[in-house]
Structures are given as structure tokens and as C-alpha cells.
Interface confidence: low
């Protein structure tokens, strides 16, 4: 028969023959022949291959370096890589999470819109009219101005995005 020019799924072409690819978690030891099937071997400890492949070496699991603020989120298997995340209070510098940076605080006049996670930084938002934040914080939202009316008081000093309103007693002479 004519030698094949293309192979089926999960096969590869070598020496005019279609050989089976090794399954995920295994590496190639030797190609198939006319008489023998592809020889594969399981990946060793701390190694993986996540696709049907003809690789002669497995990939090393990612190392979550604690010196870079990383810790293991999900341990790797022979078919999956280790997933790293950042220590509490830090977040990844990239999607691959190769190192971490400190969560940042929102300055006075800004509140936390979204608290930081292991993969995303703190998201700050300016305090809108009627709200304020007087601290630099990585977790505090903008607080609403005090309602003087509900306390039977009047506004003596207007609030800003950084300060609360100041309430005071009503001037009874002008009531």
C-alpha cells in the first residue's frame, strides 16, 4: 500500500508510518515500527505532560518560590502543572503568576471598589458626592456622610470626599 501522507487524530507521521502519540502524563521512549507500537513511559515525580504528545522529556512542575511571595494553590499531577498564587496581602504580577507585589491601599478621598485577591490588585474608586474616606486603606469603602437631619441637627460644615460633615445644634432663635 501507499505510505500515508497524513495520520488520524492522536497519531503522528514518522518514517512514512503513523505512530500513536503518548497520552497525557507519559513521554515518548521510542517510535513505533512496522511491528511494534509506540513505547511510552509515565512522567516522574514533579513532572508532567498535559497533551497527547511525542515529547522525549516531561516538563518540570512550576516551583512556587516563597521568596517571591508565591505559594501552591493546586499541586501538579503527571498531567497538570502546579498552579501558584500569592500569599495573603499580595497579588500576581502577571497572568502566569511568576512573582507577587503588595496589595496597594486606596488613598484618602478614594474607597475600595474591589478588595484585592491573589491575582488582582485593590481596585479604588473616587468617593462620590455624599461619601468620604479619610484613611489610606486596602479594605475600607467610602462611607456616607452623616445625616444631620436624622439626629435633629444641622450641617455646620460641609463634607468633602475626604471628610465627614460636621453636625451641630439648631439655632433656636432662627427656627
Amino acid at each position: 500500500p501507499e505510505p500515508p501522507t497524513a495520520c488520524r487524530e492522536k497519531q503522528y507521521l514518522i518514517n512514512s508510518q503513523c505512530c500513536s502519540l503518548c497520552q497525557p502524563g507519559q513521554k515518548l521512549v521510542s517510535d513505533c515500527t512496522e511491528f511494534t507500537e509506540t513505547e511510552c513511559l509515565p512522567c516522574g515525580e514533579s513532572e508532567f505532560l498535559d497533551t497527547w504528545n511525542r515529547e522525549t522529556h516531561c516538563h518540570q512542575h512550576k516551583y512556587c518560590d516563597p521568596n517571591l511571595g508565591l505559594r501552591v494553590q493546586q499541586k501538579g499531577t503527571s498531567e497538570t502543572d502546579t498552579i501558584c498564587t500569592c500569599e495573603e496581602g499580595w497579588h500576581c504580577t502577571s497572568e502566569a503568576c511568576e512573582s507577587c507585589v503588595l496589595h496597594r491601599s486606596c488613598s484618602p478621598g478614594f474607597g475600595v471598589k474591589q478588595i484585592a485577591t491573589g491575582v488582582s490588585d485593590t481596585i479604588c474608586e473616587p468617593c462620590p458626592v455624599g461619601f468620604f474616606s479619610n484613611v489610606s486603606s486596602a479594605f475600607e469603602k467610602c462611607h456616607p456622610w452623616t445625616s444631620c437631619e436624622t439626629k435633629d441637627l444641622v450641617v455646620q460644615q460641609a463634607g468633602t470626599n475626604k471628610t465627614d460633615v460636621v453636625c451641630g445644634p439648631q439655632d433656636r432663635l432662627r427656627a
Epitope: 496581602g89 507585589v101 503588595l102 486596602a138
Partner: antibody, heavy 120, light 112 residues
């Protein structure tokens, strides 16, 4: 205004321990990341350690890892640096510094520094 | 670790003239949010360091506008448009992107 005052320095024999303190005022201490930085006589600045605002995360320079411990007491507005097994190369002025947070990343206010001399 | 280098290490200046200091990082300090996590500090003789520039190009509060920072990624420059006598001291760059945070070796600026 922001004020950081270091204390606890002095002359110490090699191999001994020392605890430096940094008293903070003029800002909400518990909301800020804090650093220690040191400077050997006639040399440049060397970053030593950092601690998150709530004390849950701490990181160190490779040169001090295992011997130095950074800690804080937010109720006392105080940052600490415990130095064990002191060596001659630890002789330096030690500064505590506040991190400016998201708006101003990195140390934005520094203390006046405290001298630690390691000598027999 | 990110290694920081500065040049020159010594810079004699003439009052009224411009001055420029270069800082280079061994890997990019440009974060995905578009900011460069690089600060500049001045340590005047006998004093603690003071923050001049943060996030690569932002002047810290109270810093005169003759100081400016520029650059991105791995190459940064601190410029003084017209040097004054009070500007003498050692200038340091520092990366604050990832731990361990690291300083450059410093540039000593003095009057000619």
C-alpha cells in the same frame, strides 16, 4: 504630620541579639505597609524587610533571612525589628519607613535612623 | 532578584546648570497596570533619605518642579533642570515592583 522615631540601637557584641522599635504618629498606622532599610557607614541604602498593614505578610532581603524578624503592634502604633546572631556586617544606621500604598508605592516617609554597632 | 545600576556614580555639578542621572533595572519594572514601580530618593548629608519621584515620573509632595523623572521598563532618568546648592547629596533609585525590593548603588552629586 507623619513622624517615625526609631529606638533600641547601640553597641552590641557579635552573636548577641537586639530589638529595634519604631514609634509611628501622625497617620493611621494600621492602614500602612511598613519597611526597614539600613545603611552601613559610608555605604548605600539596603532594603531589609517589609510587613503588610495587618502583619499577615512579611518579606526579607536574602542577606538577613533567618536572622531578622519584622513585626508590628498596631495597638501601640509600633514597628519592630528583632536582630539575632549579630555580625560585624550588621553595623549600620537602621531606618524605619512608611510605604505610601497604592497611590505612592514604596517608602514615602522615613525615620531619622538609629545606629547599631556590632563590636567586641 | 532585580538588580539596579546607576550612572554616573559621582556627578560634579555647577549651580544653575542641568544635571541628569541614569538608573537601569535588570528586568522590567513596568507592571501590567501601566505604571513603572520605580522611585527616586535624595539623601542629603547627615539626613534621612527623602522621596523625590514615585511611579517613575510623579513628583512627591513638596518636591520642587526642577526635579523630573522619566523612562519606562528598564531605563530611567532623573533630571534636575537647574541645580541649586541645596540639591547636593546622594541620589538613589529603588524598584518596588517585587520583593526583595532593591536600591541602586547611589549617585553622589556635589558642587564643582
Amino acid at each position: 504630620q507623619v513622624q517615625l522615631v526609631e529606638s533600641g540601637g547601640g553597641v552590641v557584641q557579635p552573636g548577641r541579639s537586639l530589638r529595634l522599635s519604631c514609634a509611628a504618629s501622625g497617620f493611621t498606622f494600621s492602614s500602612y505597609v511598613m519597611h526597614w532599610v539600613r545603611q552601613a557607614p559610608g555605604k548605600g541604602l539596603e532594603w531589609v524587610a517589609v510587613m503588610s498593614y495587618d502583619g499577615s505578610s512579611k518579606y526579607y532581603a536574602n542577606s538577613v533571612k533567618g536572622r531578622f524578624t519584622i513585626s508590628r503592634d498596631n495597638s501601640k502604633n509600633t514597628l519592630y525589628l528583632q536582630i539575632n546572631s549579630l555580625r560585624a556586617e550588621d553595623t549600620a544606621v537602621y531606618y524605619c519607613a512608611r510605604d505610601g500604598g497604592k497611590a505612592v508605592p514604596g517608602p514615602d516617609y522615613w525615620g531619622q535612623g538609629i545606629l547599631v554597632t556590632v563590636s567586641s | 532578584d532585580i538588580v539596579m545600576t546607576q550612572s554616573p556614580l559621582s556627578l560634579p555639578v555647577t549651580p544653575g546648570e542641568p544635571a541628569s542621572i541614569s538608573c537601569r533595572s535588570s528586568q522590567s519594572v513596568l507592571y501590567s497596570n501601566g505604571y513603572n514601580y520605580l522611585d527616586w530618593y535624595l539623601q542629603k548629608p547627615g539626613q534621612s533619605p527623602q522621596l523625590l519621584i514615585y511611579l517613575g515620573s510623579n513628583r512627591a509632595s513638596g518636591v520642587p518642579d526642577r526635579f523630573s523623572g522619566s523612562g519606562s521598563g528598564t531605563d530611567f532618568t532623573l533630571k534636575i533642570s537647574r541645580v541649586e546648592a541645596e540639591d547636593v547629596g546622594v541620589y538613589y533609585c529603588m524598584q518596588v515592583l517585587q520583593t526583595p525590593f532593591t536600591f541602586g548603588p547611589g549617585t553622589k552629586v556635589d558642587i564643582k
